[in-house]
Interface confidence: low
Amino acid sequence: VLHYVVCFPALTEGYVGALHENRHGSAVQIRRRKASGDPYWAYSGAYGPEHWVTSSVSCGGRHQSPIDILDQYARVGEEYQELQLDGFDNESSNKTWMKNTGKTVAILLKDDYFVSGAGLPGRFKAEKVEFHWGHSNGSAGSEHSINGRRFPVEMQIFFYNPDDFDSFQTAISENRIIGAMAIFFQVSPRDNSALDPIIHGLKGVVHHEKETFLDPFVLRDLLPASLGSYYRYTGSLTTPPCSEIVEWIVFRRPVPISYHQLEAFYSIFTTEQQDHVKSVEYLRNNFRPQQRLHDRVVSKSAVRDSWNHDMTDFLENPLGTEASKVCSSPPIHMKVQPLNQTALQVSWSQPETIYHPPIMNYMISYSWTKNEDEKEKTFTKDSDKDLKATISHVSPDSLYLFRVQAVCRNDMRSDFSQTMLFQANTTRIFQGTRIVKTGVPTASPASSADMAPISSGSSTWTSSGIPFSFVSMATGMGPSSSGSQATVASVVTSTLLAGLGFGGGGISSFPSTVWPTRLPTAASASKQAARPVLATTEALASPGPDGDSSPTKDGEGTEEGEKDEKSESEDGEREHEEDGEKDSEKKEKSGVTHAAEERNQTEPSPTPSSPNRTAEGGHQTIPGHEQDHTAVPTDQTGGRRDAGPGLDPDMVTSTQVPPTATEEQYAGSDPKRPEMPSKKPMSRGDRFSEDSRFITVNPAEKNTSGMISRPAPGRME
């Protein structure tokens, strides 16, 4: 996460509903209002949904959205007949825009789309489309649900009555009725070609406030194939100001979307603001928690025969639910031990929680770098065999990374285990969670949209052994926003090791003076729990409730023509001309705590995994670690700095070395293709030398790349 000090008063940010058309500009744009009347809000943390009511009183109303729709209690309404759609079958014009608003991805519709019927009071005009999604692997991301079942994505189309108002915004500001359709996207084994223009557009708005014209698409093709079965209820906007003015039409049947296409949603970035610190992070889990129905009645359409087909099958279908693709918590107790000078043994324990038993086998992936080449191998191990694997022919001049994934039925997989990094002939060991570059805006601060993390994500380092060392990356890689994907080994080697000044075949000692000794006091402490770094013999058993994952398939997301890379800019950014987006190095601030001298201290019990994460879940704070810190300006030239003992303790500079992108294209043909590692709890290294250093920052992040929380003490055993 990139943190920088905001040198000007914090701007308040408008609600998503505030997108409006600028009719005076030469180009029609989607704008986010920054008027003082529109308070800042977020999907988690201090400005999260439970706090919306403080600045938007309607958010505490009795007729709020979204809701869970219980089919058995929905009454058939004879007035809810076929929808009349007008213009939906036409191709969109080339003036249709998509924008990353920071809270959603919105499409401003520039053509005339009208809907009537379904009990709507008039003929309504479509204004915009918005999307809500989860965090990874088809996890629950929809706002509405049916019989408790949520979907990976919910698309919402908003309408207003043009006979009554000259604009959508006027209708909202005057608290008058608007219409909204909710469409669920369901995981399919096949790409949905109708979504191609949308998916392509998403790649052009990866960064906050980016906008792009969309290729022509047919709006009808984004709706369910059958429109006859829908629910109707009266509710609200699902974002502040939560006005209770929305006539909701929730379609029963979903629209297919493949995992490959879903990755485009998971690759979107946003910026979050906590006090005067802004952070760039993935935009994920952008759904409001569900609201009580209270005295409302949910109706269902009376279109003949529309409810007959496959109702039971549909209700029983587990695809798209929270733990649908992730079949278990990660394999735990990852260890790598040298058997001799040329062989290693990787061992692990079975996941603590199995959502969809049984585990059939395990996939062991390891990648390495040699002579600047990256290679990766994957093999499987039956679950009824010993949970260990031997890697022979280990080269002392190569960097190895290992990770394990449990494989369940129907190609369902667990999250990845910790990634263990191995390199021979290394004697100095340390652990931490952030590889850091601090920054402060100049007179003209860089746009937050230009400061997104690289695909490597945050890293947790643990290691042990002489002459061998091991490093675990607790969080691994998220999707590459540039459309290319670097291998684990390349990112760790080129970005992290080079950036920290490691040279040759070993990791040099790392002075504690390089790291700032304090962290910013951020309101985000309520967003995620800080966990202590534990220098013990095994990994934490499972992630806490806010644990998250961001796997992507290797090579996924690369489109034809997207591989051209410009030369590095000063920030080490790679610029991709086709999509006009930048994929800059992840720059993060970190604090340091020294290892305690005591041995054999009692370990706290691991936090149990929670398969049903919600936007509200797991928000806890650990008192007693509050520290104030302000970022300090640093040299931004990007030149190499070998940190030495004489360095100012409040300054950190790391060389920005971009990861080498692989040339693989996503083929979609190999279901066994390994995915990038997920975010996992911090490891506990096997053993640490006396001068080990611990850099502790909470790795559990709501949106996979959240604000830094308060530090917790490191321990040695």
Partner: antibody
Framework: QSLEESGGRLVTPGTPLTLTCTVS????????MGWVRQAPGKGLEWIGI?????STYYATWAKGRFTISKTSTTVDLKITSPTTEDTATYFC?????????????WGPGTLVTVSS | SFVLTQPASVQVNLGQTVSLTCTAD??????ASWYQQKPGQAPVLLIY???SRPSGVPDRFSGSSSGNTATLTISGAQAGDEADYYC?????????????FGGGTQLTVT
Amino acid sequence: QSLEESGGRLVTPGTPLTLTCTVSGFSLSSYAMGWVRQAPGKGLEWIGIIDSRGSTYYATWAKGRFTISKTSTTVDLKITSPTTEDTATYFCAREDSYYYDSFNLWGPGTLVTVSS
Amino acid sequence: SFVLTQPASVQVNLGQTVSLTCTADTLSRRYASWYQQKPGQAPVLLIYRDTSRPSGVPDRFSGSSSGNTATLTISGAQAGDEADYYCATSDGSGSSYQCVFGGGTQLTVT
């Protein structure tokens, strides 16, 4: 709800042939439709499907040899250049709308004989 | 390419229970469907997603899956159950999606 194949006949090798599946009782905009064939005395062999949006997917061996298309009420299978190995009964089938890989409605089939 | 293996033929006594198997290297990660085909007729879907039974299919037919083997079990076999039985699953995803049928098992009821 029913399916009926037509167009099966005796053709000489290399002569393109189009089979048609006519649907009734449901809309092709809501379902994927597949073609499966069965050579005499042999097992079922999946050729390909066309989904509700018109995207087509083919078996590896069938790519280039077959083309699937559709209108509002029919699904066509074109055998671009038949060989004697293409002699079989051709079935069209409707794919379950929520569960892929399963066909819950089948036509009776139409026989294609390729012989010189 | 992905191959589903079924025994060519299986015999069962009237009223007895019989299990038909379908195996593949990575079937543990996929759902299997089962079809019944009687001579001169089109196939009929019996089981989908390993264990689910469409309406109208007698509950004598059940599906299960363990490891790399999917199993169709017919309890209380009847003369009318004599037919060919095919398993099927999908291979690949996204644009490379395809469906695969097993070679079929001829069930004889004696």
